[in-house]
């Protein structure tokens, strides 16, 4: 009878064991274990009847198609075999064991005691068959194994071979190299590779196989295993395989598909090909006069590009348009995309106008072409070139007028300051009385007229100021403050301010320049109680033209000490002392209550301590601060009552040889003007130089040299 065994281990004994087995007996044990295991059989006891070639009693071990062993007897002889210590190993997961005894036994035989167990098959070691073994890596586990692939490869659906994903290769460059995967190492199995060469229309792809060509083939059948096919439009070239590379292929197409197929076996090194684009040839090129062509080649083909450029100082001219370079291209029909342009000398054209300046040409015929030279100069004596620039500009290769220091920027003509068109009188002789000023003696003098038309009746008053530049007037803050507010400082509205420059005689305003205000800027810390920081600026609506009667005064250097005691300074004014005079009377009628002609007075600077003491000795809150200085005579007699508020107190600066505004007429009192020991108080301008430059939007370094010269 047959016994089916399915356990992973077990014991088999002869019938009746350990007693003697019966005669004429036959038992078969079929052992089946799971796939991935084999069966190991060994005997602990064996005692059967001996016979030649085990004809009588025996134990036979077999698989489905193979006898693994036949055992009988007690000990091994030449013609019979006992298992002894031998282990029987099945090749697969099945083993059949048959015990047979014949009809007679001369002795009592005890039979056998056998054991079996399932043991793991190490498929990775034992698979010799290429068809079954792993392509790259094999991993054994109890009861089975699995395969894996090297980096860049994918396990095929057969779970054994390693393929690559190579169906998405696009080549658009005009030349390139294409190889089988992993070349020159053996190419992967079970792969379908697709390479597309897609060039611009007009190109034709030429293919050339190189180096090694090794694709699995067959002696009789053409390329049944692995192969290359080349598809050009509807036409297919190939298949190609073996060890002989195809001849160079001229596809006559800009689009080519290369298919490479490998099956699941074989170890071949693969292939490599280079491709290049071919196109139509274009005619030879001649560079233009004063120009060159890059790159310079013997031949040019479709898609080749050349850049036409000109020598320094020349520009490419194409269809009347100037450019730095011009590119032309070889077209697919073998013609150039454009004619070669010409090279034209660079022209900087007419140089830019210089405000308050003029231009002279150094080159004959007023040439404005490359390397021509011009010279800018300022309208002297009213303007001077900033930083003493040479003013020389050369026409550059870029087509712009260039100066060595300023580059393409134009020079700046700054108003000359503190240089009247006629000399101010010598300060050696002390003049006690005020006197008429000659025209042009105080060209910075400004008459400021404020007419507040927003009130009924209209409020109107006057003050003086000093021209600092073509656009800015310096004056006292109290001149531009609206007195209808006492607890706060409110500047007058710019619409209510008119400035007169170049005015000499108030009866004749025809020669004067009048300007509206664009901005009124009071010092933010101006104090109406003690007139500390009594300084302000008016920006004019338009810059005024400078000339002999309109020129700026210089600002001082930043010096907290201010003007030195006993220095003589000049103050000018029209002496508008009658508060009931109207603007029309001032500007037109020349009422007798004021001086028609600009007056000036010479006054010495008073030591600060002396002035402070003189005011402290009076009853009242008079405060001579560090932002003020005093001028006048101890004995009185002359003062700036006749000079308008905000007017400039100027001192001649020996270093720069210019007149500098050191003070602004601010306040005085309480006794009548010109009283004994009543000094006029002036805003110390040198304390505000930075503030003034900041308001005017000019860095100090720009204008400082005016005074430093």
């Amino acid at each position: 009878h047959t016994v089916e065994l399915n356990n992973m281990f077990g014991q088999i004994q002869s019938p009746g064991y350990p007693d003697s087995y019966p005669s004429d007996s036959e038992v078969t044990w079929n052992i089946t274990v799971p796939d991935g295991f084999r069966i190991k059989l060994y005997f602990m006891h064996f005692n059967l009847e001996s016979s030649y070639l085990c004809e009588y009693d025996y134990v036979k071990v077999e698989t489905e198609d193979q006898v693994l062993a036949t055992f009988c007897g007690r000990e091994t002889t030449d013609t019979e075999q006992t298992p002894g210590q031998e282990v029987v190993l099945s090749p697969g997961s099945f083993m059949s064991i048959t015990f047979r005894s014949d009809f007679s036994n001369e002795e009592r035989f005890t039979g056998f005691d056998a054991h079996y167990m399932a043991v793991d098959v190490d498929e990775c070691k034992e698979r010799e068959d290429e068809e079954l073994s792993c392509d790259h890596y094999c991993h054994n586990y109890i009861g089975g194994y699995y395969c894996s692939c090297r980096f860049g490869y994918i396990l095929h659906t057969d779970n054994r071979t390693c393929r690559v994903e190579c169906s998405d290769n696009l080549f658009t460059q005009r030349t390139g190299v294409i190889t089988s995967p992993d070349f020159p190492n053996p190419y992967p199995k079970s792969s379908e590779c697709l390479y597309t060469i897609e060039l611009e229309e007009g190109f034709m792809v030429n293919l050339q196989f190189e180096d090694i060509f090794d694709i699995e083939d067959h002696p009789e059948v053409p390329c049944p295993y692995d192969y290359i096919k080349i598809k050009v439009g509807p036409k297919v070239l190939g298949p190609f395989c073996g060890e002989k590379a195809p001849e160079p292929i001229s596809t006559q197409s800009h689009s080519v598909l290369i298919l490479f197929h490998s099956d699941n076996s074989g170890e071949n090194r693969g292939w490599r090909l280079s491709y290049r684009a071919a196109g139509n040839e274009c005619p030879e090129l001649q560079p233009p006069v004063h120009g060159k062509i890059e790159p310079s080649q013997a031949k040019y083909f479709f898609k080749d590009q050349v850049l036409v450029s000109c020598d320094t100082g020349y520009k490419v001219l194409k269809d009347n348009v100037e450019m730095d370079t011009f590119q032309i291209e070889c077209l697919k029909d073998g013609t150039w995309s454009n004619k070669i342009p010409t090279c034209k000398i660079v022209d900087c054209r007419a140089p830019g106008e210089l405000e308050h300046g003029l231009i002279t040409f150094s080159t004959r015929n007023n040439l404005t072409t490359y390397k021509s030279e011009i010279k800018y100069s300022c309208q002297e004596p009213y303007y001077k070139m900033l930083n003493n620039n040479t003013g020389i500009y050369t026409c550059s290769a870029q087509g712009v007028w260039m100066n060595k220091v300023l580059g393409r920027s134009l020079p700046t003509c700054l108003p000359e300051c503190g240089q009247p068109s006629r000399s101010l009188p010598s300060l050696v002789k002390r003049i006690i009385g005020g006197r008429n000023a000659e025209p042009g003696l105080f060209p910075w003098q400004a008459l400021i007229v404020v007419e507040d038309t927003s009130r009924v009746p209209n409020d109107k008053w006057f003050g003086s100021g000093a021209l600092l530049s073509a656009s800015w007037i310096l004056t006292a803050a109290h001149v531009l403050r609206s007195q209808r507010r006492d607890t706060t400082v409110i500047p007058v509205s710019k619409e209510h301010v008119t400035v007169y420059l170049g005015l000499h005689d108030v009866r004749d305003k025809s020669g004067a320049v009048n300007s509206s205000a664009a901005r009124v800027v009071l010092h933010p810390d101006f104090n109406i109680q003690n007139y500390n920081h009594d300084i302000a600026l008016v920006q004019l609506q338009e810059p005024v033209p400078l000339g002999p009667h309109v020129m700026p005064v210089c600002l001082p250097r930043l010096e907290p000490e201010g003007p030195a005691p006993h220095m003589l300074g000049l103050v000018a004014g029209w002496g508008i002392s009658n508060p009931n005079v109207t603007v029309d009377e001032i500007i037109s009628s020349g009422t007798r209550t004021l001086s028609d002609v600009l007056q000036y007075v010479k006054l010495p600077v008073v030591p600060h301590a002396e002035c402070k003491t003189s005011y402290e000795s009076r009853s009242g809150n008079y405060s001579v601060t560090e932002n003020m200085f005093c001028a006048g005579y101890y004995e009185g007699g002359k003062d700036t009552c006749l000079g308008d508020s905000g007017g400039a107190f100027v001192i001649f600066d020996d270093l720069s040889q210019r007149w500098v505004v050191q003070g602004l007429v601010s306040w005085g009192g309480p006794e009548e003007c010109g009283s004994k020991q009543v000094y006029g108080v002036y805003t110390k301008v040198s304390n505000y130089v930075d503030w003034v430059w900041e308001q005017m939007g000019l860095p100090q370094s720009v204008v400082e040299p005016q005074v430093e010269r």
Epitope: K460, Q483, R485, D486, G620
Partner: antibody
Framework: QIQLVQSGSELKKPGASVKVSCKAS????????MSWVRQAPGKGLKWMGW????????TYADDFKGRFVFSLDTSVRTPYLQISSLKAEDTAVYFC?????????WGQGTLVTVSS | DVLMTQTPLSLSVTPGQPASISCKSS???????????LNWLLQRPGQSPKRLIY???KLDSGVPDRFSGSGSGTDFTLKISRVEAEDVGVYYC?????????FGQGTKVEIK
């Protein structure tokens, strides 16, 4: 110290004129305007107007236009109030006060009596 | 003209007690420059007026800090935290925002 010293009391007949002065000291005179304020007997204060001490331009409240004139003598730091064609209802104390709108310091007042 | 209305018109206060005077204007006193020109003054019996407060809440120098001003727009208040004998007199508010400047009718403060 800041002081506003007004002229003394006046007794005037109807139709006459009067000029009240207000001498200022202790500060920069042209820095502040000068206001004039009337106080009728037993009544409250009424602002008459002000004069800009820098420009000399006066501004009058509507009730004080015509017979009332503000003026200045800057050299002696003195504003003046002149009333012409006096009427009995002009009887009042007239104050000067420093400032157009500030009125931070006041004179001691001048009593003007109009009586026949 | 801007009408200034003070309340109460008279006030009798025990020394050491607080006092409060209200002043209302017929239109806002905030001017185009963002300032409010509302002031308070005291006229003691037989004397000329003396300004106490300007720009609503700023105290003039020499004015005791028991005085304080507050308000905005059209409603303003003068407060005395502890009234003293020297505080008697007539208190006026006035505005300097809209021409012509106008005074309140006055509030008479007496000591009980």
């Amino acid at each position: 110290q800041i002081q506003l010293v007004q002229s003394g009391s006046e007794l005037k007949k109807p139709g006459a004129s009067v000029k009240v002065s207000c001498k200022a000291s202790g500060y920069i005179f042209t820095s502040y305007g000068m206001s004039w304020v009337r106080q009728a007997p037993g009544k409250g204060l009424k602002w008459m107007g002000w004069i800009n001490t820098y420009s000399g331009v006066p501004t009058y409240a509507d009730d004080f236009k015509g017979r009332f004139v503000f003026s200045l003598d800057t050299s002696v730091r003195t504003p003046y109030l002149q009333i012409s064609s006096l009427k009995a209802e002009d009887t009042a104390v007239y104050f000067c006060a420093r400032g157009g709108e500030a009125m931070d310091y006041w004179g001691q007042g001048t009593l003007v009596t109009v009586s026949s | 003209d801007v009408l200034m209305t003070q309340t109460p018109l008279s006030l009798s206060v025990t020394p050491g007690q607080p006092a409060s005077i209200s002043c209302k204007s017929s239109q806002s006193l905030l001017d185009s420059e963002g300032k409010t020109y509302l002031n308070w003054l005291l006229q003691r019996p037989g004397q000329s007026p003396k300004r106490l407060i300007y720009l609503v809440s700023k105290l003039d120098s020499g004015v005791p800090d028991r005085f304080s001003g507050s308000g905005s727009g059209t409603d303003f208040t003068l407060k005395i935290s502890r009234v003293e004998a020297e505080d008697v007199g007539v208190y006026y508010c006035w505005q300097g925002t809209h021409f012509p400047w106008t005074f309140g009718q006055g509030t008479k403060v007496e000591i009980k």
